[in-house]
C-alpha cells in the first residue's frame, strides 16, 4: 500500500535538485577564487539538512544556519544592487558592471536561483511531486524561508549607497509584500547605509512619465526616510540603452538621459 503523501499547491522540487545544486556550487567556486576553499559536498549536506525530514511548513531561519555559515562571503558592501520584479535586467546589469552584486551573484543566491525544493516530515525523501505554495499553503516553507534568510543577511551587509532596480511596468512599482519590500528594506542598517537609490525601469518605449512620482515610490521614500536613510530616485527610460551605456560609457549617445 503506497504511503499517503501530502499534496501541496505548488510545484514539486526541481528535477535533479541535488546534482544541480552541486554543479552550481562547483562552477561558482571555480569562477570565484575567493570561494575556492568551499567544499561543495559539505554545502550540499548543509542545504539538505535544512529541509530533509522536516515538515515543509515548519522551516525556520535556524534550519539554514549551517548553510549560511558555509556560504559566508564578503561582497563590497557599497556595491550592492537590490531588485524587485525585474530580476533579468538586474542580472544583465551586474554581468556587465562586474563590480556590482545582486544576491544571485553570491554563492548562496546562485545555488538556489529559480529552484524549488522541499522534503517530507520524518522521511529522508525529497518531494518531487509538490511543495507548499507561499499563499495557498504556508509561508514558512523551505524556499520562502531560504530567500528570507539570505535576503535579510544581504541587506544587513549593505553600506553607503545601496541601489535597487524596480519594475516601472507593474501596477505596484514598489510592493510592500515583495522580498525587497518586506525583508530587505527593513534590514538596511541606518548606521551603515547613507542612501537608497531607486532605479525605476520603464517598459514602454514612448513612456516619458516621471515614475519617481508614483504613489508607491513615495511610500518607499517614506519608509526609508523614517529609518533615517536618504532616498533618491531615477527614471531609466530606455533600459536597452542603459545597458549599452554601461558596456560602452564613452559612447557619444550616452551623455543624454537614459
Amino acid at each position: 500500500v503506497p504511503r499517503w503523501r501530502q499534496q501541496w499547491s505548488g510545484p514539486g522540487t526541481t528535477k535533479r535538485f541535488p546534482e544541480t545544486v552541486l554543479a552550481r556550487c562547483v562552477k561558482y567556486t571555480e569562477i570565484h577564487p575567493e570561494m575556492r576553499h568551499v567544499d561543495c559536498q559539505s554545502v550540499w549536506d548543509a542545504f539538505k539538512g535544512a529541509f530533509i525530514s522536516k515538515h515543509p511548513c515548519n522551516i525556520t531561519e535556524e534550519d539554514y544556519q549551517p548553510l549560511m555559515k558555509l556560504g559566508t562571503q564578503t561582497v563590497p558592501c557599497n556595491k550592492i544592487l537590490l531588485w524587485s520584479r525585474i530580476k533579468d535586467l538586474a542580472h544583465q546589469f551586474t554581468q556587465v558592471q562586474r563590480d556590482m552584486f545582486t544576491l544571485e551573484d553570491t554563492l548562496l543566491g546562485y545555488l538556489a536561483d529559480d529552484l524549488t525544493w522541499c522534503g517530507e516530515f520524518n522521511t529522508s525523501k525529497i518531494n518531487y511531486q509538490s511543495c507548499p505554495d507561499w499563499r495557498k499553503d504556508c509561508s514558512n516553507n523551505p524556499v520562502s524561508v531560504f530567500w528570507k534568510t539570505v535576503s535579510r543577511r544581504f541587506a544587513e551587509a549593505a553600506c553607503d549607497v545601496v541601489h535597487v532596480m524596480l519594475n516601472g511596468s507593474r501596477s505596484k512599482i514598489f510592493d510592500k509584500n515583495s522580498t525587497f519590500g518586506s525583508v530587505e528594506v527593513h534590514n538596511l542598517q541606518p548606521e551603515k547605509v547613507q542612501t537608497l537609490e531607486a532605479w525605476v525601469i520603464h517598459g514602454g518605449r514612448e513612456d516619458s512619465r516621471d515614475l519617481c512620482q508614483d504613489p508607491t515610490i513615495k511610500e518607499l521614500e517614506s519608509i526609508i526616510s523614517k529609518r533615517n536613510i536618504q532616498f533618491s530616485c531615477k527614471n531609466i527610460y530606455r533600459p536597452d540603452k542603459f545597458l549599452q551605456c554601461v558596456k560602452n560609457p564613452e559612447d557619444s549617445s550616452c551623455t543624454s538621459e537614459i
Epitope: 528535477k15 535533479r16 541535488p18 546534482e19 562552477k27 571555480e30 559536498q41 529552484l115
Partner: antibody
Framework: QELVESGGGLFQPGGSLALTCKAS?????????MCWVRQAPGKGLEWIAC???????TDYATWAKGRFTISKTSSTTVTLQMTSLTAADTATYFC???????????WGPGTLVTVSS | DIVMTQTPSSVEAAVGGTVTIKCQAS??????LAWYQQKPGQPPKLLIY???TLASGVSSRFKGSGSGTQFTLTISDLDSADAATYYC?????????????FGGGTEVVVK
C-alpha cells in the same frame, strides 16, 4: 579515489550482460553524476548514459535508449545493463565521475566486452 | 542530439612546435566544453573544462579557447609525451537533461 569496472568478457549475440563500476575512496551517497562511455577498438569515445546519485535521474544517448539501463545499485556501485547484444557493442566500457559542472575528472581503466559467436 | 565535429583527424608536428585542434558544435553550448587526452590502453584524462579552464595538474602548455559553437585546443612547446589522441566533449547540464557528445578525436604525432 578510484573507479574500477568489471563484468566484461566474451558474450553471445542477442545475449545480455551487466557491467559494474565500483567506487573506492569516496561514497556515491554523496552527490555525483556517474557516466558510462564506450570505445570500439581503434575508434573514438561514445557517451552512453549518466545517472545522478542524489536524484536517481538518468540520461541516455538517443541510440542507447531502450537497450541500456544505468542504475545506482549501492553506495559504492553503479551498474550498466545491456540487452540484445550485437557485434557493434564490442568495445572497452569506461565509467567516469562528474563531481559537478561537467568535469569528468575520474575514470576507471575500462572493461572489454566482446560480442561474438 | 548535439554533434561535435573535430578537425583534423590527425596532425604531425615536431618537438617544440605548436598544434591546433578545432572542435565545432552543431548548436551553441556556451562554454560547456571539455578536452581530454587519451594514450593507448589508458582511459581519457581531463585537460580542460569550461572551454578554457585548465584541470588540476595539467601543464600550461595546453590552452583552450572559444565559446558558442567554435572551440580550439592549442598545445605549444610540443613534447614527445604529448603524443596521444585528443577529444573534445560537450556537456550541457540542466535541471532536465545531461546530454553529452564527444568529437571524433585528433591523433597528435610528435616527430
Amino acid at each position: 579515489q578510484e573507479l574500477v569496472e568489471s563484468g566484461g568478457g566474451l558474450f553471445q549475440p542477442g545475449g545480455s550482460l551487466a557491467l559494474t563500476c565500483k567506487a573506492s575512496g569516496f561514497s556515491l551517497s554523496n552527490i555525483y553524476v556517474m557516466c558510462w562511455v564506450r570505445q570500439a577498438p581503434g575508434k573514438g569515445l561514445e557517451w552512453i548514459a549518466c545517472i545522478g546519485t542524489g536524484s536517481g535521474d538518468t540520461d541516455y544517448a538517443t541510440w542507447a535508449k531502450g537497450r541500456f539501463t544505468i542504475s545506482k545499485t549501492s553506495s559504492t556501485t553503479v551498474t550498466l545493463q545491456m540487452t540484445s547484444l550485437t557485434a557493434a557493442d564490442t568495445a572497452t566500457y569506461f565509467c567516469a565521475r562528474d563531481p559537478g559542472a561537467g568535469t569528468w575528472n575520474l575514470w576507471g581503466p575500462g572493461t572489454l566486452v566482446t560480442v561474438s559467436s | 542530439d548535439i554533434v561535435m565535429t573535430q578537425t583534423p583527424s590527425s596532425v604531425e608536428a615536431a618537438v617544440g612546435g605548436t598544434v591546433t585542434i578545432k572542435c565545432q558544435a552543431s548548436q551553441t553550448i556556451g562554454s560547456r566544453l571539455a578536452w581530454y587526452q587519451q594514450k593507448p590502453g589508458q582511459p581519457p584524462k581531463l585537460l580542460i573544462y569550461s572551454a578554457s579552464t585548465l584541470a588540476s595538474g595539467v601543464s600550461s602548455r595546453f590552452k583552450g579557447s572559444g565559446s558558442g559553437t567554435q572551440f580550439t585546443l592549442t598545445i605549444s612547446d610540443l613534447d614527445s609525451a604529448d603524443a596521444a589522441t585528443y577529444y573534445c566533449q560537450s556537456y550541457y547540464y540542466t535541471s532536465t537533461s545531461y546530454p553529452n557528445a564527444f568529437g571524433g578525436g585528433t591523433e597528435v604525432v610528435v616527430k
